[in-house]
Amino acid sequence: LTCLGGFASPGPVPPSTALRELIEELVNITQNQKAPLCNGSMVWSINLTAGMYCAALESLINVSGCSAIEKTQRMLSGFCPHKVSAGQFSSLHVRDTKIEVAQFVKDLLLHLKKLFREGQFN
């Protein structure tokens, strides 16, 4: 079984489906946000370019105890070819500013929607 985004499926999930599901989850997070997401936790912002999925996971995986983003963390791991652990930052990850998780999610969502519209599913 292939497990992506926490859902078991009979075969590999098409990249377009996986990206759409990730977008839907981020939309769900932003729309259901009442109190500050993850209680205002701050994470490193990322360059939304090559290696974006791993960089996003590297940033968000450091936040623990925030159930609202646990599914997103699992889904991002399906897009990242290597295992990511808390405190791990690749050379692609430039640590220049921290932003609230809520802003991180909004920025990521906008970029993923753009990629989806342009047919860039990987």
Epitope: P36, C38, N39, S41, N62, S64, C66, G87
Partner: nanobody, 116 residues
Framework: GVQLLESGGGLVQPGGSLRLSCVAS????????MDWVRQAPGKGLEWVST????????YYADSVKGRFTISRDNSKNTLYLQMNSLRAEDTAVYYC?????????WGPGTLVTVSS
């Protein structure tokens, strides 16, 4: 649990200096990445600076680069922020935070007012 207590804030004239301190308890301080975050009156949270556990890595927001210096003394479980060349726009409540934790685990903050 995590406890953080900031001190060192106050009223200072533009161009002046202050040194903020934050005493930490309830967690293993020397392996924790630590942040300074601020909130200006009526504004949102703004990240100021981060220091890695080993003190090897220090990171700053563009708005404070070259003026502020973050440091830590792991033997005293204390985080510092040396603020020089202060400007009116640095007026804010400054919070010390264990990185990646929510506001419920931050300290109460210390108010810095820069005014002539």
């Amino acid at each position: 649990g995590v406890q953080l207590l900031e001190s060192g804030g106050g009223l200072v004239q533009p161009g002046g200096s202050l040194r903020l301190s934050c005493v930490a308890s309830g967690f293993t301080f020397d392996v924790a990445e630590m942040d300074w975050v601020r909130q200006a009156p009526g504004k949102g949270l703004e990240w100021v600076s981060t220091i890695s556990p080993s003190r090897r890595g220090t990171y700053y927001a563009d708005s404070v680069k070259g003026r502020f210096t973050i440091s830590r003394d792991n033997s005293k479980n204390t985080l510092y922020l040396q603020m020089n060349s202060l400007r009116a726009e640095d007026t804010a409540v400054y919070y010390c935070a264990k990185a990646y934790t929510g506001r419920s685990l931050w300290g109460p903050g210390t108010l810095v007012t820069v005014s002539s």
